[in-house]
């Protein structure tokens, strides 16, 4: 299992361990879900589900999610809240993850060009942490410059990747357009021909990044969309096989799947679509929208079912003097959201064949 190939078996893993985890996943045809966390509660829900499923997990903070982690009352001028929130989330996850006994990849999600000051802030924190501990604060980061030209996208990634590689840090990048909207990137009206990344584009990324370090993954577009999308989705995960083949032929390597790929915009996808992606080298699947809704359902159902017990601090159907503290205590109703979000993650771990891989 996974634990055999990791130097650090539990808690936040970095460097070679991240590379070995993704290599193992690719070889054994499973993918690791990446859960967007916005609070200690959502982080705990993900960690608990992964622990109970004997699975590794990726916890990631988006730009907006990081700002929320810091607190909605803080100004995000100069990406201040997003930087502080991401760092706070990282320290929180680093301190609590070992208690769950599973390997955790600590990641930051989509960073568009206009959000690069956020990336700079996280990277500075990584470098400071590296000086002190010999490893970066985060396991990995994502740059999403898919709105820019390929040339600018790749050159910006190269610039940052050189800094990251010095800390043996993983980079996820995106090329081609994933429809819908994500922090700072809105591709809802993208030209149809742009919804499928071309193999040549993917190879250009490989050619630029691989000489720096093998620690990178590519989110290529195959008709997928962020969020729940009402448009005419034509998901073609089998296209990822073309990317693997083209890069393999260009490089002349024997490895069947030289690329580490990422599945974005998976809400509403079928099990078979996920499996096709995973069989073709997908090692990470982003889960956000589905988890957000799952988290809500537990709280929603609790509030609806306990309506008569939460209308006032005292007084319920059992009597006018009966206290309602045990019903309105946040630890009770927030926990319900954790349970339903955890159940969704448990199901996803099964779908992605991650269950029992430790």
């Amino acid at each position: 299992g996974v634990e055999q190939i990791l130097k650090r078996k539990t808690g936040v893993i970095v460097g070679e361990d991240v590379h070995n985890l993704f290599t193992y996943a690719k070889e054994h045809k499973f993918a690791i879900p990446a859960i967007n966390v916005t609070s200690s509660s959502t982080a705990v829900a993900a960690l608990e589900a992964a622990r109970d499923s004997k699975s590794p997990i990726i916890l990631q903070t988006s730009n907006g999610g990081a700002a929320y982690f810091a607190g909605k009352g803080i100004s995000n001028e100069g990406q201040n809240a997003s930087i502080k929130g991401a760092i706070a989330a990282a320290h929180y996850i680093r301190s609590i993850a070992p208690a769950y006994g599973i390997p955790v990849v600590l990641h930051s999600d989509h960073c568009a060009k206009k959000l690069l000051p956020w990336f700079d802030g996280m990277l500075e924190a990584d470098e400071a942490y590296f000086k002190e501990h010999g490893e970066p604060l985060f396991s990995s980061h994502m740059l999403d410059l898919s709105e820019e030209t390929d040339e600018e996208n790749i050159s910006t990634c190269v610039k940052y990747f050189k800094r990251m590689a010095a800390m043996d840090q993983w980079l996820e990048m995106e090329i081609g357009i994933t429809g819908g909207e994500e922090d700072g990137v809105n591709n809802e009206n993208a030209d149809k021909e742009d919804l499928y990344t071309k193999p040549e584009q993917v190879y250009n990324v490989y050619k630029a990044l691989h000489p720096i370090s093998p620690n990178f993954s590519i989110a290529a577009a195959f008709g997928n969309c962020h969020g729940l999308y009402a448009g005419d989705i034509a998901l073609r995960p089998e296209i990822l096989a073309e990317h693997q083949k083209y890069t393999r032929e260009q490089v002349g390597c024997k490895e069947e799947k030289p690329l580490f790929l990422v599945f974005h915009g998976g809400s509403g996808s079928t099990v078979q679509e996920f499996h096709t992606g995973i069989d073709n080298g997908v090692v990470k699947v982003n889960l956000d929208t589905d988890c957000q809704y799952a988290y809500l359902t537990g709280i929603r159902d609790y509030v609806l079912n306990k309506k008569d017990y939460i209308m006032s601090p005292v007084g319920n159907p059992e009597g006018p003097e009966k206290p309602n503290k045990k019903f309105f205590d946040p630890r009770v109703w927030v926990r319900e959201g954790e349970k339903t979000m955890g159940a969704k993650i448990t199901k996803s771990l099964e779908t992605f064949r991650t269950t029992n891989t430790l």
């Epitope: 149809k192 021909e193 919804l195 499928y196 071309k198 008709g223 005419d232 034509a234 073609r236 995960p237 089998e238 296209i239 990822l240 096989a241 073309e242 693997q244 083949k245 096709t276 073709n280």
Partner: nanobody, 119 residues
Framework: QVQLVESGGGLVQTGGSLRLSCAAS????????MGWFRQASGKEREFLAR????????FYADSVKGRFTISRDNAKNTVYLQMNSLKPEDTAVYYC????????????WGQGTQVTVSS
């Protein structure tokens, strides 16, 4: 637009095999995703299988996975559907379709070929 003509249909017994062919005309064949669909009498059109432009990637409907195999020969501008272990419920008109990489879904369709599986 790619023009498509299917062939290879016919009458076959349960458990038998058939190989359908779809000949495409048009210079863009090697940059298309090709697919097979079917429509049984009184039913909606059903997706069966897809294949990427070089043939590196395939995708199958659960109903035919393991029994049907899609392949293509770009030198001959032809896509195939090998159908094994046929059942009476496979009886339908089988259609070939093409999706250009600048299109969001299949947009070119053949006229279809009838497959009848007798018990």
């Amino acid at each position: 637009q790619v023009q498509l003509v299917e062939s290879g249909g016919g009458l076959v017994q349960t458990g038998g095999s058939l190989r359908l062919s779809c000949a495409a005309s048009g210079r863009t064949f090697s940059r298309t995703i090709m697919g097979w669909f079917r429509q049984a009498s009184g039913k909606e059109r059903e997706f069966l299988a897809r294949i990427t432009w070089s043939g590196a990637g395939t995708f199958y409907a659960d109903s035919v996975k393991g029994r049907f195999t899609i392949s293509r020969d770009n030198a001959k501008n032809t896509v195939y559907l090998q159908m094994n272990s046929l059942k009476p419920e496979d009886t339908a008109v089988y259609y070939c379709a093409a999706q250009g990489l600048d299109q969001r879904d299949f947009s070119s369709w053949g006229q279809g070929t009838q497959v009848t599986v007798s018990s």
